[in-house]
Interface confidence: low
């Protein structure tokens, strides 16, 4: 691939996982035992956009898959989807906006950031089963951080 | 200050074993990705291999001149990285450096794109 | 397995500037960096991710990559800057070398 990436899965902060509902979103839920495989595996790669020493532009493809997660305005909201790209030209270097995320490390714990929308972050609701989104607010309800546990290409 | 002191090179002959240190000293050593490098007489660089941070498993790579002959392996807890060289060739006459990722990177992927420190390098030769 | 390609010799005159490049298939799509060589001496990085400059680097270097062509810049060449020059991108989570380029301050 042209671009670097690294194989993982994402846990929010109350240890749910991610998973496939229907073709186009994901959801979060707790996952135990052989539930784990269901688990999404992301390629994270990196890529060019603003960057500083705490914030890392990265995209986020589902392995083997051509899907990435994008933002775009939806009825004037800033909106969460699983974007189909041609698998010929992704990833690459420099990624359209929509589908940069600044990963920000905090205290261990990770925050997916839109490029294309400053403080919208990928969030989980406290709920079980209920779709990934993209969220206005930080420190409320809904929960904005993740851990990344690597996985072996 | 953040330093890299690479040990263990002398001369050995084909066939045989070596053992190579890469002791670092002033940063956070476990959270760095760790390259090998070397250099023949005369000749440009070449890439060995590395090992990841801890936070993304420790993983290796290889260059495939070396793919199952030469082991990277790491102790954080003594801030030392390894490489072990086996079956030794002759073309495998060169000076080996080791290095870390650049600073700004170590958050991102624990490896990147440059490498910010180097070691002094270790002489390994390689002859009957 | 990908190849990165350098001119062997590159001249200059003090106070000119000096531009080395480094050819490869889609170099624009991948990052490079370089580093600069002393006899005797280990490598030092003097540009990572395309364009950035570690602390510590002279303003006077400057990197650019785009299409098949990554480039080394030198303005307001010095003859401290006679060297030897690498450029390194990453391909398939290998690293990829050019083979130098000797940078000559006449």
């Known amino acids: 691939a042209p671009v670097r990436s690294l194989n993982c899965t994402l846990r929010d902060s109350q240890q749910k996982s991610l998973v496939m509902s229907g073709p186009y979103e994901l959801k979060a839920l707790h996952l135990q035992g052989q539930d784990m495989e269901q688990q999404v595996v992301f390629s994270m790669s990196f890529v060019q956009g603003e960057e500083s020493n705490d914030k890392i532009p990265v995209a986020l493809g589902l392995k083997e898959k051509n899907l990435y997660l994008s933002c775009v305005l939806k009825d004037d909201k800033p909106t969460l989807q699983l974007e189909s790209v041609d698998p010929k030209n992704y990833p690459k270097k420099k990624m359209e906006k929509r589908f940069v995320f600044n990963k920000i490390e905090i205290n261990n714990k990770l925050e997916f950031e839109s490029a294309q929308f400053p403080n919208w972050y990928i969030s989980t609701s406290q709920a079980e089963n209920m779709p990934v989104f993209l969220g206005g607010t930080k420190g409320g309800q809904d929960i904005t951080d993740f851990t990344m546990q690597f996985v072996s290409s | 200050e953040v330093q890299l002191v690479e040990s263990g090179g002398g001369l050995v002959k084909p066939g045989r074993s070596l053992r190579l240190s890469c002791t670092g000293s002033?940063?956070?050593?476990?959270?760095?990705?760790l390259n090998w490098f070397r250099q023949a007489p005369g000749m440009g660089l070449e890439w060995v291999g590395f090992?990841?941070?801890?936070?993304?498993?420790?993983?290796?790579e290889y260059a495939a001149s070396v793919k199952g002959r030469f082991t990277i392996s790491r102790d954080d807890s003594k801030s030392i990285a390894y490489l072990q060289m086996n079956s030794l060739k002759t073309e495998d006459t060169a000076v080996y450096y080791c290095?870390?990722?650049?600073?700004?990177?170590?958050?991102?992927?624990?490896?990147?794109?440059?490498?910010?420190?180097w070691g002094q390098g270790t002489t390994v030769t390689v002859s009957s | 397995s990908y190849e990165l390609t350098q001119p062997p010799s590159v001249s200059v005159s003090p106070g000119q500037t000096a531009s080395i490049t480094c050819s490869g298939d889609?170099?624009?799509?991948?990052?490079a960096c370089w580093y600069q060589q002393k006899p005797g001496q280990s490598p030092v990085l003097v540009i990572y991710?395309?364009?950035k400059r570690p602390s510590g680097i002279p303003e006077r270097f400057s990197g650019s990559n785009s299409g098949n062509t990554a480039t080394l810049t030198i303005s307001g060449t010095q003859a401290m800057d006679e060297a030897d020059y690498y450029c390194?991108?990453?391909?398939?989570?290998?690293?990829?070398f050019g083979g130098g380029t000797k940078l000559t301050v006449l």
């Open positions: 991710q395309d364009t």
């Open positions: 889609k170099l624009g799509d991948k990052f």
């Open positions: 090992i990841r941070g801890k936070a993304y498993g420790g993983t290796t």
């Open positions: 002033g940063f956070t050593f476990g959270d760095y990705a």
């Open positions: 290095n870390r990722e650049v600073e700004y990177c170590r958050s991102s992927e624990n490896y990147c794109y440059g490498m910010d420190v």
């Open positions: 390194q991108a990453w391909d398939s989570n290998t690293v990829v």
